[in-house]
C-alpha cells in the first residue's frame, strides 16, 4: 500500500480516529491512515488513526500481522473508515476477544503516533470508545 521511498512534501489525508490517542476527536490528519487490532489480556483493542509523518508509519505498516497484533495502513481521505484489522487465523477463526475497557498497555508505539498519548487506562476507556 505504501511507496517504498519517503516523500518530502507528501499530501496530508483526513483519517478516522478511534481509540485512546484520539482524545475527544473523531478524526486526525496525517500522511497515512491506519486501522489496528491487538490483544490485551484476552481482549481485543481496536484503534484507528493517522501517522503524521510518513517515516513514522513506514515500519509499522510493513509489519506482517502476528497472532497478537495487526495493522492495516492506507493513503487517501477517510480511507481507514471501512477497514477493520483482523488477526491472522489458522483455519477456524477461534478465538476472538471482547472489546472491553482495559487497564494496561497499548498496541502502537508512542513514536509511531508522533508522541500522542497511548497508555490505556481504565479512566480513558471508560470515557472513550477504544477502537
Amino acid at each position: 500500500v505504501e511507496d517504498e521511498k519517503p516523500k518530502v512534501n507528501q499530501k496530508l489525508y483526513m483519517c478516522v480516529c478511534e481509540g485512546l490517542s484520539c482524545g475527544n476527536e473523531d478524526h486526525c490528519e496525517g500522511q497515512q491512515c491506519f486501522s489496528s487490532l491487538s490483544i490485551n489480556d484476552g481482549f481485543h483493542v481496536y484503534q484507528k488513526g493517522c501517522f503524521q509523518v510518513y517515516e513514522q508509519g513506514k515500519m509499522t505498516c510493513k509489519t506482517p500481522p502476528s497472532p497478537g497484533q495487526a495493522v492495516e495502513c492506507c493513503q487517501g481521505d477517510w480511507c481507514n473508515r471501512n477497514i477493520t484489522a483482523q488477526l491472522p487465523t489458522k483455519g477456524k477463526s477461534f478465538p476472538g476477544t471482547q472489546n472491553f475497557h482495559l487497564e494496561e498497555q497499548k498496541l502502537i508505539s508512542e513514536e509511531d503516533l508522533g508522541g500522542e498519548q497511548k497508555l490505556i487506562s481504565e479512566e480513558d476507556l471508560h470515557h472513550h470508545h477504544h477502537h
Epitope: 489480556d41 481482549f43 477461534f94 478465538p95 476472538g96 471482547q98 472489546n99 471508560h126 477502537h131
Partner: antibody, heavy 116, light 108 residues
Amino acid sequence: EVQLVESGGGLVQPGGSLRLSCAASGFTFSTYAMSWVRQAPGKGLEWVSAISGSGGSTYYADSVKGRFTISRDNSKNTLYLQMKSLRVEDTAVYYCANSPSWFDPWGQGTLVTVSS
Amino acid sequence: DIQMTQSPSSLSASVGDRVTITCRASQSISSYLNWYQQKPGKAPKLLIYAASSLQSGVPSRFSGSGSGTDFTLTISSLQPEDFATYYCQQSYSTPPITFGQGTRLEIK
C-alpha cells in the same frame, strides 16, 4: 476440539445462591477472555459478565452487579459464575463463551430456575 | 448504552428465497457488529464477525454488510436448515455488550 461445558444449574428459591461452572478444553484457556450470556425462556440473548484472560479485570451487566461474581481458575481451565440473591427474573439458560469482539464458541448452556 | 434494533422481528420465507435481516445501532459502531444463528434448544452460533467477515465453516450463502449504524445479514438462497432465530450484537463500546432482540425466520 474446542469445547465448553457448563454445569451447576438447577432449581433455587428467590434469594438463594448457585455457582455455575464452565469447563474449557481444546485451547489455551488462560490466553482468552471469557463471558457469561443468558437467555430467559422464549426471550433474547443478554450479556451477563466477562473476565479477562488473567482474571484481573471483570465486568458486569447492571442487572447483576453486586449479586453475581465471575471468576476463573486457569490451572483448572474453568470459568465460574457465583450467583447470590437470585430473583425470579434471573431464570434463564446460562451460556459460557469465549469472549470475543464476537462470542465463539459457546457452551451448551445450563438452566437456572428461580422459583418458590 | 448502545441499543440494537433488528427488523423484522419475524419473517416467513420459502426455500430458495433471498432473505435480508437488518440491524440498526442507536449510534455509530463502525464495523463492530456480529451476527449469530440460534436453533431451538441449541446455543447460538457465530455466522459473521466485524460486519462482513464470514466465520470459518459457515456457508457462503450468508453474507454481512454495513458500517456505522445500519447493517444487514443476507441469505442468498434459503436452505431448510436456515430456519432459525438470528441475532446481531455490537462490540464497539465498553460494557454492556448488547444484542438485538432477534429475528425469527420461519417457513412460509
